[in-house]
């Protein structure tokens, strides 16, 4: 393709300034918002190369990539319009190259501004500015090992870019992977550079190779899928926890109870009450207040701890972790013992609003 | 500016079926994949179906599995949903939706269109 | 399919309120969670993708994090025009499947 590098003018007119480079119709590069534009700088010998957008010096940054004679925007705006130059410098003399970028939708009048993923590589339709493949969002690939229960879906990604578009394919331990080679097949998105397997079972264990390559070169990536076969049991509860505790009056104390479960378990918090003198109901079931379950701001790692602050001898009794999954329900419950503070009466306080369960 | 635009709903009896189109403008259509979601009255959001840019992907909710069709014209700029053998379960407020490129979140949506299954 | 929850399935603030709504998958999607409004009549409009990342025009109050099955968006102080319904959609397996809805009311 042509060069379109500055070349020495020597037909300047004496009025207009002296300059050394006339350009000499650069070429534009056309990019929508959000997608990632690459360019070559198309110097010769360019050892130290400096770039520069509408004269100024340009540095790298989170989304500006300057490699070698690579120039890479990722998740392009209308902002990154402009005329750039790369300079490639040497011992004798420099040499400065031009080009245009223009960021806009070629059908949408430029307002389609909010496609800030940067996933897709991007190269203008009408340049030469070929490239063997190259992974664009390396961050989607770093978890290498996936070990995944049985009957979930698993999804491997490999975001690749190049010119011209890289096609990808997929191995299974080094071989096609066929769909036929898995009851139910895969789902391969190509425009998300993904494959998908639903309802995983022990013999979709493996390697997975991703191998993403154009007429300029070839990548791959693997993956190992180790598939953990469901145990049907409910949760199961940590031996001697919650632990029967004591505290005096206006202490602090904490209830600790660690679940261990396959299918996902809600976990509560209860305490056993007495109603009108009695512990059980007429039917024989016993009074219960739920003090803590998962909700809006609870984690499964806060919920496996229940703090008591300021303890009254109202908190006295029977704690009970409960923890329930689609098999079943386990619970295990512990003591808490509240000893009167040296020289203060025993507190009274109202008695709280009751569940029944 | 990127607009999308429903049309093809109205009442149809149990049984029977109906086409939905979705006229996009204001974007390359072809380099976007395109989505279906619907709205029962209400009620929440149910994804219904996805198509490729380039068509040659497609995959349906279980519900809607064997009786709706998903695909599109890229030379008419337009997303097509065919839904056969409809049941009352299927009467919500359609929508077609733009996939951001790579992250299939919703970027876009049409104003939607009203499918309402009643004998 | 992959399910997902959301807690609480309404609630109620005030303006300048910080509002946290949260979403479960019931298996690990990794970071493929998005985050939608919707108002009465309206088609629902994107606020957060991938998790975390802002969509363009969205107001810096609305954030979104988490990761594998638990995610959260926060509406840092709640204004006026946020009072709506917000859904939550994970893409991370071929059906793209939303959370039932959160509604966020005027107390």
């Known amino acids: 393709r042509p060069s379109f590098s500055l070349v020495e003018d020597t037909t300047l007119e004496p009025e207009e300034p002296p300059t050394k480079y006339q350009i000499s119709q650069p070429e534009v590069y056309v990019a929508a918002p959000g997608e990632s534009l690459e360019v070559r700088c198309l110097l010769k010998d360019a050892a130290v190369i400096s770039w520069t957008k509408d004269g100024v010096h340009l540095g790298p940054n989170n989304r500006t990539v300057l490699i070698g004679e690579y120039l890479q925007i990722k998740g392009a705006t209308p902002r990154d319009s402009g005329l750039y130059a790369c300079t490639a410098s040497r011992t004798v003399d420099s040499e400065t190259w031009y080009f245009m970028v223009n960021v806009t939708d070629a059908i949408s009048s430029g307002d389609d501004e909010d496609d800030t993923d940067g996933a897709e590589d991007f190269v203008s339709e009408n340049s030469n500015n070929k490239r063997a493949p190259y992974w664009t969002n390396t961050e989607k690939m770093e978890k290498r090992l996936h070990a995944v229960p049985a009957a979930n879906t698993v999804k491997f990604r490999c975001p690749a870019g190049g010119n011209p578009m890289p096609t990808m394919r997929w191995l299974k331990n080094g071989k096609e992977f066929k769909q036929e080679h898995r009851i139910g097949g895969y789902k391969v998105r190509n425009q998300h550079w993904s494959l998908i397997m639903e309802s995983v079972v022990p013999s979709d264990k493996g390697n997975y190779t991703c191998v993403v390559e154009n007429e300029y070169g070839s990548i791959n990536h693997t993956y190992h899928l180790d598939v953990v076969e469901r145990s049907p049991h409910r949760p199961i509860l940590q031996a001697g926890l919650p632990a029967n505790a004591s505290t005096v009056v206006g202490g602090d104390v904490e209830f600790v109870c660690k679940v261990y479960s396959d299918a996902q378990p809600h976990i509560q918090w209860i305490k056993h009450v007495e109603k009108n003198g009695s512990k059980y109901g007429p039917d024989g079931l016993p009074y219960l207040k739920v003090l803590k379950a998962a909700g809006v701001n609870t984690t499964d790692k806060e919920i496996e701890v229940l703090y008591i602050r300021n303890v009254t001898f109202e908190d006295a009794g029977e704690y009970t972790c409960l923890a329930g999954n689609s098999i079943g329900i386990s619970f295990h419950s512990a003591w808490l013992t509240v000893l009167p503070a040296p020289g203060r009466e025993k507190e009274i306080t109202a008695s709280p609003d009751y569940l029944e369960i | 500016q990127v607009q999308l635009l429903e049309s093809g709903g109205g009442l149809v009896q149990p049984g029977g079926s109906l086409r939905l189109s979705c006229a996009a403008s204001?974007?390359?259509?072809?380099?976007?994949?395109m989505s279906w979601v619907r709205q029962a009255p209400g009620k929440g959001l149910e994804w219904v179906s996805v198509?490729?840019?380039?068509?040659?992907?497609?995959h349906y909710a279980d519900s809607v599995k064997g009786r709706f069709t998903i695909s599109r014209d890229n030379s008419k700029n337009t997303l097509y949903l065919q839904m056969n053998s409809l049941r009352a379960e299927d009467t919500a407020v359609y929508y077609c939706?733009?996939?951001?490129?790579?992250?299939?979140?919703?970027?876009?949506w049409g104003q939607g269109t009203l499918v309402t299954v009643s004998s | 399919d992959i399910q997902m929850t959301q807690s609480p399935s309404s609630l109620s603030a005030s303006v300048g309120d910080r509002v946290t709504i949260t979403c479960r998958a019931s298996?690990?999607?990794?970071?493929?969670l998005n985050w939608y409004q919707q108002k009465p009549g309206k088609a629902p409009k994107l606020l957060i993708y991938?998790?975390?990342n802002l969509q363009s025009g969205v107001p810096s109050r609305f954030s979104g994090s988490g990761s594998g099955t638990d995610f959260t968006l926060t509406i840092s102080s709640l204004q006026p025009e946020d009072f709506a319904v917000y859904y939550c959609?994970?893409?991370?397996?071929?059906?793209?499947?939303f959370g039932q809805g959160t509604k966020v009311e005027i107390k």
């Open positions: 204001g974007f390359t259509f072809s380099d976007y994949a």
């Open positions: 198509i490729e840019g380039d068509g040659s992907y497609t």
């Open positions: 991938d998790a975390s």
């Open positions: 939706a733009r996939e951001k490129t790579y992250s299939s979140a919703f970027d876009y």
């Open positions: 959609q994970q893409h991370y397996s071929p059906s793209h499947t």
């Open positions: 298996q690990d999607i990794s970071s493929d």
